[in-house]
């Protein structure tokens, strides 16, 4: 009689993540008497992966019905496929002996390979503000995919980058892996609308690319433009200066008004306009009373913005040609957002 | 479900015999092996063997060989394990487990003394 | 025949703590035949870890199993008042299947 051959007919096998494998084995002949045990990977440290008659595997079923008394068919289903399962498989038949069952004769090898789809792509940005004509970085993660070919791409409100560094790990072979790559990106005044898109495309998408995406709005700082001018007189002894606070972003400012180099008034912007481009413009205006003076008057509107160092604007105010109001110790008079009086 | 339902317990002499029995439900009963392991009071777990129910094939721990006598009856679902020659010392829980290690059965007191 | 060696005998912690404990084989035993198994007075032990680190249906995540060779380990991260119990390492890897003695994870 001819000597047992144990068969694996599928030199390879391709299968997606989550799904199930099936692993196909038959012998050739029931003598030797003797059990099929599945491992995977060769060697003393090879994995078993299912055991006919001993042991816990609770995603392996069999195909058929191992007790039947002439079954010849070992072929496996492994379910919830992971990329960790890849590997080679094979299908060793034993036989009986003592203490322990001896291998007699192994199938060749099925080789499992796993289609596993990229993570969405994180896209992250600086962790500081950066300010228009400012190269900026920025970092696009994605992981646990398989096979290794992978496509990845940069826009800027849809107009692709080319300046950009990618790397994918590792450079051997594993059971997944994971892409990074960096970016450059030089900011505008108009950036604050603008999207950083990460872009990538795997076998596993089916044409289908995934996208990450970081709104710049996170990254700029559009520092204002300051504008401080007087304005006719409103009342006798009184002069309205105003402070225009152009094209700014983020929202977070802070204004102070200084007289010959004294604080006046301090103020948040609240309420703000928008401008199409996304950046804010805010105003404020103080109403000097110039009988208060003896001199001419040095106004500054002083602004903090988003934490920076503070920028400002100076406008001189001349007293001279104004009488000076008797009993008046009224040196400003805020007429802003809420209407206070300052002493 | 899987079930193992083993028999009562059992006081004996020392010298005699005891025969524990291990009846399976919910599970094809020649798939896999059934192993006995015992516990003596206060004490570890102890393999005493196995036998495989689709064709009665045996291993033992050799500690055992000589007293113990595994057997099976395919046509009810039920392993037997028998021990001869008992001592005190065999005193203890014995249990039938699955060859998958997750299901045991209840466990049965057997209680040596004369 | 290969000997497990469980340590410690012992172990007194209180509920929340981290529990580490370990299994040593007198030769290598392959990671695939490695089991942990849970005993709590009057019942039959409980399969946690199969495969020296795959958890078993039902078993809590904090729950779990590391090592190969000859050096393996049972990891409880944060102990819930019914983790007091014995556990037990046991190797199929070769005749005769052997269990360690055991671990006692008492309240401290």
């Known amino acids: 009689e001819e000597e047992l051959q144990v068969i694996q007919p599928d030199k390879s096998v391709l299968v997606a993540a989550g799904e199930t494998a099936t692993l196909r084995c038959t012998a050739t002949s029931l003598i030797p008497v003797g059990p099929i045990q599945w491992f995977r990977g060769a060697g003393p440290g090879r994995e078993l992966i299912y055991n006919q008659k001993e042991g816990h595997f609770p995603r392996v079923t069999t195909v058929s019905d191992l007790t039947k008394r002439n079954n010849m068919d070992f072929s496996i289903r492994i379910g919830n496929i992971t990329p960790a399962d890849a590997g080679t498989y094979y299908c060793v038949k034993f036989r009986k002996g003592s203490p322990d069952d001896v291998e007699f004769k192994s199938g060749a090898g099925t080789e499992l390979s796993v289609r596993a789809k990229p993570s969405a792509p994180v896209v992250s940005g600086p962790a500081a503000r950066a300010t228009p004509q400012h190269t900026v970085s920025f970092t696009c993660e994605s992981h646990g995919f398989s096979p290794r070919d992978i496509t990845l791409k940069w826009f800027k409100n849809g107009n692709e980058l080319s300046d950009f560094q990618t790397n994918v790990d590792p450079v051997g072979e594993s059971v997944s892996y994971s892409i990074h790559s960096t970016a450059k990106v030089v900011l505008t005044r108009e950036d604050v609308h603008s999207q950083v898109i990460c872009e990538v495309a795997h076998v596993t998408l089916q044409g289908d690319p995934l996208r990450g995406t970081a709104n710049l709005s996170e990254t700029i700082r559009v520092p204002p433009t300051l504008e401080v001018t007087q304005q006719p007189v409103r009342a006798e002894n009184q002069v309205n200066v105003t402070c225009q606070v152009r094209k700014f972003y983020p929202q977070r400012l802070q204004l102070t008004w200084l007289e010959n180099g004294n604080v006046s008034r301090t103020e948040t912007a609240s309420t703000v306009t928008e401008n199409k481009d996304g950046t804010y413009n805010w105003m404020s205006w103080l109403l000097v009373n110039v009988s208060a003076h003896r001199d001419d008057v040095k106004l500054t509107c002083q602004v903090e913005h988003d934490g920076q160092p503070a920028v400002s604007k100076s406008h001189d105010l001349k007293v001279s040609a104004h009488p000076k109001e008797q009993g008046s110790n009224t040196a400003a008079e805020n007429t802003g957002s809420n209407e206070r009086n300052i002493y | 479900q899987v079930q193992l339902v083993q028999s009562g317990a059992e006081v004996k002499k020392p010298g005699a015999s005891v025969k524990v029995s291990c009846k399976a439900s919910g599970f094809n009963f020649e798939d896999t092996y059934i192993h006995w392991v015992r516990q003596a009071p206060g004490q570890g777990l102890e393999w005493m063997g196995r036998i495989d129910p689709a064709d009665g094939d045996t291993k033992h721990n050799p500690k055992f060989h000589d007293r113990v006598t595994m057997t099976v009856d395919t046509s009810t679902n039920t392993a037997y394990m028998e021990l001869s020659s008992l001592r005190s010392e065999d005193t203890a829980v014995y249990y039938c487990?699955?060859?998958?290690?997750?299901?045991w059965g209840q466990g049965t007191t057997v209680t040596v003394s004369s | 025949e290969i000997v497990l060696t469980q340590s410690p005998a012992t172990l007194s912690l209180s509920p929340g703590e981290r529990a580490t404990l370990s299994c040593r084989a007198s030769s290598s035993v392959t990671s695939s035949y490695l089991y942990w198994y849970q005993q709590k007075p009057g019942q039959a032990p409980r399969l946690l870890i199969y495969?020296?680190?795959n958890l078993a249906s039902g078993i809590p995540a904090r729950f779990s199993g590391s090592g190969s060779g000859t050096d393996f380990t049972l990891t409880i991260s944060s102990l819930e008042p019914e983790d007091f119990a014995v556990y037990y390492c046991h190797q199929w890897y070769s005749y005769p299947r052997t269990f360690g003695g055991g671990t006692k994870v008492e309240i401290k």
């Open positions: 495969s020296a680190s």
């Open positions: 487990v699955r060859g998958n290690y997750v299901n």
